[in-house]
């Protein structure tokens, strides 16, 4: 007879897996809120700021009640990759005014990266279809002025904040259905 079979592969508990993803998302949400408040204190902004290169808010993609886990995770991963790219761009090209948001902006980037890895892991553990590799995104043009960089920062942090709220709501709602 051949060698004894190895220990059975423990299938992950999807609720526990989702839980740790929600925890990271909530933690990043709190960081983003704090950084957005810091930005508002230093550079008050009137009204909503938009940046055409940012993803459309996921919440407009449909009511939360109709969401399915693969759709939420795929959409969230795509949106967060875009936000990661924008945060990197902001740190590189945002100008001297935004240097006052370091090291917090660097910490945010690292935590965003960690959440993206966590999502990737969750998708593979739950045997969800892996999204195709992302096509190379066109480079982001540098802000036209110092104020342009500040407006971009308001748009990026505001959009990320709302996206993370959508993610927490969606993931916790899906958890109740598992």
């Amino acid at each position: 007879p051949g060698p004894p079979p190895g220990p059975p592969r423990v299938s992950p508990d999807p609720r526990a897996e989702l839980d740790s993803t929600v925890l990271l998302t909530r933690s990043l949400l709190a960081d983003t809120r704090q950084l957005a408040a810091q930005l508002r204190d230093k550079f008050p902004a009137d009204g909503d700021h938009n940046l055409d290169s940012l993803p459309t808010l996921a919440m407009s993609a449909g009511a939360l009640g109709a969401l399915q886990l693969p759709g939420v995770l795929t959409r969230l991963r795509a949106d967060l990759l875009s936000y990661l790219r924008h945060v990197q761009w902001l740190r590189r090209a945002g100008g001297s005014s935004l240097k006052t948001l370091e090291p917090e902006l660097g910490t945010l980037q690292a935590r965003l990266d960690r959440l993206l890895r966590r999502l990737q892991l969750l998708m593979s553990r739950l045997a969800l279809p892996q999204p195709p590799p992302d096509p190379p995104a066109p480079p982001l043009a540098p802000p036209s002025s110092a104020w342009g960089g500040i407006r971009a920062a308001h748009a990026i942090l505001g959009g990320l904040h709302l996206t993370l709220d959508w993610a927490v709501r969606g993931l916790l709602l899906l958890k109740t259905r598992l």
Epitope: L23, R26, L29, M59, L64, G65, L172
Partner: antibody, heavy 119, light 111 residues
């Protein structure tokens, strides 16, 4: 001053519907979720659901799914809760409350709207 | 759903005394340094008022005599020295999962 002002008391017959409004002022309406909480006499507070004013639809406590409908009018900074197929157990004070994104704690509350269901 | 049980149901104390209110959850509401428990005060005919969020953070404008502690399933709201205006009903609430739920309340009365 941050404020949530709710519509007045309502008396309804069983089977009817009620729609309560909650007008927000003193803060950016879209920066927070709007939650709704029920307080029936002698019962514990009950979370009904919440809505993000940016859109994407509300989420509900399963107990209220199908009977509660949460909506917002962003331009008027006003949230609404409609409760249909009313029964006597729906007699309660209903509160709107400002909810911290992603954390569900409520730092500003409306004054409450009393709904009485009686034939 | 997570069930929160508060004790005692009522408590009679005098101004100046220390009040300790307890809230126990049917399962852990803490994860990696976060405890998703919040405390509210409610007076008759009024809406609840947030006192403490995420177990131990004092809400802006709330007097420093209020403090929150605990983790896992057991949480405490402490009022270090009672003032006349503190006599009210206190509720704990969790937001660990959906739906958020509330405890049944502890009524703090003047002795």
């Amino acid at each position: 001053e941050v404020q949530l002002v709710q519509s007045g008391a309502e008396v309804k017959k069983p089977g009817a519907s009620v729609k309560i409004s909650c007008k927000a002022s003193g803060y950016t309406f879209t920066d927070y979720n709007m939650d709704w909480v029920k307080q029936a006499p002698g019962q514990r507070l009950e979370w009904i659901g919440d809505i993000n004013p940016h859109g994407g639809g509300p989420i509900y406590n399963q107990k209220f799914t199908g009977r509660a409908t949460l909506t917002v009018d962003k331009s008027a900074s006003t949230a609404y809760m409609e409760l249909s197929s009313l029964r006597s157990e729906d007699t309660a004070v209903y509160y709107c409350a400002r909810g911290e994104l992603g954390h569900w704690y409520f730092d500003v509350w409306g004054q409450g709207t009393t709904v009485t269901v009686s034939s | 759903d997570i069930v929160l049980t508060q004790s005692p149901a009522s408590l009679a104390l005098s101004p100046g005394e220390r009040a300790t209110l307890s809230c126990r959850a049917s399962k852990s509401v803490s994860t990696s340094g976060y405890s998703y428990i919040h405390w509210y005060q409610q007076k008759p005919g009024q809406a609840p008022r947030l006192l403490i969020y995420l177990a131990s953070n004092l809400e802006s404008g709330v007097p420093a005599r209020f403090s929150g502690s605990g983790s896992g399933t057991d949480f405490t709201l402490t009022i270090s020295s009672l003032e006349e205006e503190d006599f009210a009903t206190y509720y704990c609430q969790h937001s660990r999962d959906l739906p958020p739920t509330f405890g049944q309340g502890t009524k703090l009365e003047i002795k």
